[in-house]
Amino acid sequence: AQGKEVVLLDFAAAGGELGWLTHPYGKGWDLMQNIMNDMPIYMYSVCNVMSGDQDNWLRTNWVYRGEAERIFIELKFTVRDCNSFPGGASSCKETFNLYYAESDLDYGTNFQKRLFTKIDTIAPDEITVSSDFEARHVKLNVEERSVGPLTRKGFYLAFQDIGACVALLSVRVYYKKCPELLQSLARFPETIAGSDAPSLATVAGTCVDHAVVPPGGEEPRMHCAVDGEWLVPIGQCLCQAGYEKVEDACQACSPGFFKFEVSESPCLECPEHTLPSPEGATSCECEEGFFRAPQDPMSMPCTRPPSAPHYLTAVGMGAKVELRWTPPQDSGGREDIVYSVTCEQCWPESGECGPCESSVRYSEPPHGLTRTSVTVSDLEPHMNYTFTVEARNGVSGLVTSRSFRTASVSINQTEPPKVRLEGRSTTSLSVSWSIPPPQQSRVWKYEVTYRKKGDSNSYNVRRTEGFSVTLDDLAPDTTYLVQVQALTQEGQGAGSKVHEFQTLSPEGSGSLAV
């Protein structure tokens, strides 16, 4: 219950007729009219977020104090999210400052900043993001501050903008008295307010049934101020575990609901895959086969490990294999799925198998993968490979079984030719190569690609059935990049590494040198 409120100033009720002072004139705060709920409403607004060094003031008219000694200032306002502007508007702010000044007379339009004392920086609980703005959902913040004791005949309030996008929809100033109070699940009796400014009566509160002072917390106490308002709440009562706050009382959690600690939160419905709880439950047990990871909140459903990756393919591409899979059909109810890839190689002749992690290269680390594909390279020809992809989530460690799928692939591509420079002159290079005899029968031709080093725009290709070639019509004293690749009926074999060979300079003595 609130005390009697005696209103001294109400901007929203004045219908835009108050005519507050803006400084600098015409640059910052602006009185706007808008339509809300089919009703015209007035607001003071400012939105100079793209310019730095803003110092825009809005001052109320002079307010007669009367008998008030401590005043309460209730602000209703909206603040736009700085991130809703392009580039985040680097000079944009999301707060404004509240000031007051006391005086025995109305200064009219004579505004002097130095007379004002800061009450507080006002920050919103909720900022208006782009979607709210577009949908015209005004995220209205309500903040209340108090000032006192006041001693002069009247006062002004002032609002300083330092670069926010803010609209003040309501400014209400009032003073009040102390009723019987039920707050924070503590009951405070009606209290006569002291008559002197320093006189604050300390009143002890009593926790309602099934509410307790939280561990380490203070006993609930409040102070009744001269203006009739309860001030400075100390301590609080919270509903014990298994109970939730309903209006001003603590009520047992209904069957199927739980609350696991002394807190302000309500009872939560037992999450999925838990057993039904009795009335007043403090937790909900997991169904058989379902688990909670240590970091899972009690409010999260119990979950289980995922099934195996749904579909796994291994596509050979020369000496590489691309593994692709789809997520498990059953995620276990979790989103923290990761994948691990392991590799086994088998020699076809002996049938002997062993791990191959050290001899292959993965496109990214093969453990803790979040993507559903990986490329494995540096595979050996004439070798059979088996890849295993395992799916895991946050509760996989709580069971011994694993969820995996395997795929096998044979590597048939020829080995890269081993290339040698047999001889060179000022205008030619003689090159030879070899590949293992068992693979030679599969080779149809060899393709020799060469180009000047540093010239990426053109290259030359020679094809031959033999194991050597002389490259003619070359430039003297020039380095050439040479690569040899076997061509088979299945396509291109692995290319040799790119060699750098240099022709002789015209001054070179011999016509042939190795």
Partner: antibody, heavy 128, light 107 residues
Framework: EVQLLESGGGLVQPGGSLRLSCAAS????????MAWVRQAPGKGLEWVSR????????HYADSVKGRFTISRDNSKNTLYLQMNSLRAEDTAVYYC?????????????????????WGQGTLVTVSS | DIQMTQSPSSLSASVGDRVTITCRAS??????LAWYQQKPGKAPKLLIY???NLHTGVPSRFSGSGSGTEFSLTISSLQPDDFATYYC?????????FGQGTKVEIK
């Protein structure tokens, strides 16, 4: 760079139908309110219809209510205007226009919108 | 619907001139008013919104003022690129009506 490209205009007989499209690129289409504005030959601008960023709400000028339907497909970055029961007075260049709240430096949105970005327009001629 | 009336309907001016166009609303629209520039055969371009806010990239020689029912667009020093037709638009109501336009021609 924001680009809006209208298509689908042409000659149609009174009572006929046309469907205009507006292909958007260079911005996040699903963040924008979109609208159609028309301009009869030698005349001023007339707002026709608008649609919210996610497909609603929609508003129409009285002159087209019940005959025109605005829609959008955010997956295709495209705005549409289905025009039925066309009349001679619907003859105009039809512009697709957009509004992004990020460039609207006000604390509370206006009761309606203005138009920050415009397409080049497509001509609709209704004549027998 | 809210009616928007622009004046003059056309004006002749020289490069460097200060030009002011006015727009009157048939009822109060607070400051919910935008100004656009349109050249022949081209789409309109936004200049000003909320009566006085300059749209991104618009030269500072353009300025807007007014609230309630009386508004004006001022070009402080007319440039060759500014010869065009200018429209005001209210967005205080869902009808989003435009003025009839003011054509700025070379004297």
């Amino acid at each position: 760079e924001v680009q809006l490209l209208e298509s689908g205009g042409g000659l149609v007989q009174p009572g006929g139908s046309l469907r205009l499209s507006c292909a958007a690129s260079g911005f996040t289409f699903s963040h924008y309110m979109m609208a159609w504005v028309r301009q009869a030959p030698g005349k001023g601008l007339e707002w026709v219809s608008r649609i919210g960023p996610s497909g609603g709400p929609t508003h129409y000028a009285d002159s087209v209510k019940g005959r025109f339907t605005i829609s959008r497909d955010n997956s295709k970055n495209t705005l549409y205007l289905q025009m039925n029961s066309l009349r001679a007075e619907d003859t105009a260049v039809y512009y697709c226009a957009g509004y992004d709240s990020g460039y609207d430096y006000v604390a509370v949105a206006g009761p309606a919108e203005y138009f920050q970005h415009w397409g080049q327009g497509t001509l609709v001629t209704v004549s027998s | 619907d809210i009616q928007m009336t622009q004046s003059p309907s056309s004006l002749s001016a020289s490069v460097g001139d200060r030009v002011t166009i006015t727009c009157r609303a048939s009822q109060s629209i607070s400051t919910w008013l935008a100004w656009y520039q349109q050249k022949p055969g081209k789409a309109p371009k936004l200049l000003i919104y909320k009566a006085s806010n300059l749209h991104t990239g618009v030269p500072s020689r353009f300025s807007g003022s007014g609230s309630g029912t009386e508004f004006s667009l001022t070009i402080s020093s007319l440039q060759p690129d500014d010869f065009a037709t200018y429209y005001c638009q209210q967005y205080n109501s869902y009808s989003r009506t435009f003025g009839q336009g003011t054509k700025v021609e070379i004297k």
